[in-house]
């Protein structure tokens, strides 16, 4: 229930967050599950624990395994598991599928590629970006905060993009790389007031308590490439990031698709371990562009799992 997969490359920094939640003030102890050996907190160690974070500085293939984190609240100790796999660096340029983060899509005027997991690290701009192992050069490429913007995207821009940055820990620098695929949808067209295809207005979505649930906000904005089009989720009228519930997260970046020639965006809201309290919230799918904003509201209802008796 409280388990998470993480991966990295040998000789790079890897930072993993405990899948079990808790207040920042809570002590978190980490153990290597196979041996039940405590992970030290002293930063002089190559692998050490720092609150909710487990740091491999740098990582080694032998570090692979399951790590247990115990969040010590004032009442109970709460346990989570991090399944860590460290891979050897490839000698050739190909990045294997098991090292790839989720694919993102873009178009001529919507070409952000986010650098995965970067928020866990202590890094300073700018990021370095590579496409198919070649450093990106030229004015079309702009590294902005934690993402890459490509101006005047062309179909040839599709490929595997790697972000590389330096994690700094007590004056020591460690390299981190993360790779994801970028696909291009390029069309000329027109722009319309946003049309939300899903969810339907005032839709009731049935969810099972204790299970994970996904809500997709999908909207179309016209034909071809779109300028300043976005979809996002709000909870009780508040941005997901400001709502402060780590179990409820938007999928990083926006996936672009083309439906019957229309340019559409979708944003997935992931709710982990659905709780009864989630049914009380108002979920708003927002679609906006230069023409204006449209909002569809969803509420969750409890789906009682069917009991199967022999």
């Amino acid at each position: 229930k409280f388990s998470k997969q993480s991966w990295g490359l040998e000789n790079e920094a890897l930072i993993v967050r405990c899948p079990r939640q808790g207040k920042p003030s809570y002590t978190v102890d980490w153990y290597y599950s196979q041996t039940n050996k405590s992970i030290p907190t002293q930063e002089r160690n190559r692998v050490f624990a720092s609150g909710q974070l487990l740091k491999f500085l740098p990582a080694a293939v032998a570090d692979s395994g399951i790590y247990t984190c115990i969040v010590r609240s004032p009442t109970f100790n709460r346990t989570g598991y991090a399944n860590v796999t460290i891979y050897k660096k490839q000698s050739d340029c190909n990045v294997p599928d098991y090292l790839m983060y989720s694919t993102v899509s873009g178009s001529e005027k919507n070409s952000k590629i986010y650098c995965p997991t970067i928020d866990l690290y202590n890094w300073t701009a700018p990021l370095e970006w590579f496409k198919n192992c070649q450093a990106l050069q030229g004015s079309r490429y702009r590294a902005h905060k934690s993402f890459l913007v490509i101006d005047n995207v062309m179909t040839e821009d599709a490929g595997d993009y790697t972000c590389k940055f330096i994690h700094n820990e007590n004056g020591a620098n460690y390299s981190v790389t993360a790779t994801r695929s970028f696909t291009v949808k390029d069309e000329q067209g027109f722009s319309l007031f946003p049309v939300i295809g899903a969810p339907a207005q005032n839709e009731i979505k049935e969810v099972e308590i204790g299970k994970n649930a996904n809500l997709t906000c999908s909207a179309c904005f016209g034909k071809g490439t779109q300028f300043l089009a976005a979809v996002l989720w709000q909870l009780n009228g508040t941005k997901i990031t400001d709502f402060g519930e780590p179990r409820i997260q938007q999928e990083e970046g926006q996936n672009q698709s083309f439906s019957n020639g229309l340019a559409c965006l979708d944003m997935v809201l992931r709710i982990a371990d659905v709780k009864e309290e989630d049914l009380l919230l108002q979920y708003d799918c927002l679609a906006l562009n230069l023409h204006g904003l449209r909002r569809h509201t969803v509420r969750l209802s409890r789906k009682n799992p069917i009991d199967h008796h022999s």
């Epitope: 920042p24 003030s25 609240s73 004032p74 009442t75 709780k275």
Partner: antibody, heavy 121, light 106 residues
Amino acid sequence: QVQLVQSGAEVKKPGASVKVSCKASGYRFTDSEMHWVRQAPGQGLEWMGTIDPETGGTVYNQKFKGRVTMTADRSTSTVYMELSSLRSEDTAVYYCTRAFYNDFDDGFAYWGQGTMVTVSS
Amino acid sequence: EIVMTQSPATLSLSPGERATLSCSASTSVSYMHWYQQKPGQAPRRLIYDTSKLASGIPARFSGSGSGTDYTLTISSLEPEDAAVYYCQQWSSNPLTFGGGTKVEIK
């Protein structure tokens, strides 16, 4: 919706024991620790302890240690609080209560209706 | 244990006035929760994690503070706000409540 329904009022003699029940519904019972808080007439709130229904683990306020026992029955989604060696100062309303999101200990969001326990000779 | 001291014990104000309730902890705590209790009812969570408004609570209630000193503010009192208000810490075992502040509406 989340509901905590407690057993009815009790009148006990000094030295006796009382067992108060709290039946939970509207959420997965093992997902949230259950706490017990009491309130003497005209007085403030006092935390007695908590139980993790998943493991049966308990944490008690030292003040009640040795006298209080909290248990959970997963088959009926019910927690129990038993207080022994009752004295007149144990006369109070006893509440079961739980946090909104368990891991974040974000205050007691849900409360039972309370059970009045009167200790009198 | 951490002792929570609330002041004043009683606050008597007119509708529309601003109410400021204080809670002082004997040792620094990370967060404070606030509850409202009316006669014959169970307490109701108002503010959690120092400043977050609980679901269904009017925006006239707000919380602030850090360390040992915390405040619950009711910006403009309504007649239905007459109640006893409790602060509570969840930083240390045993969890403890303040003695309460009674708010009376003139």
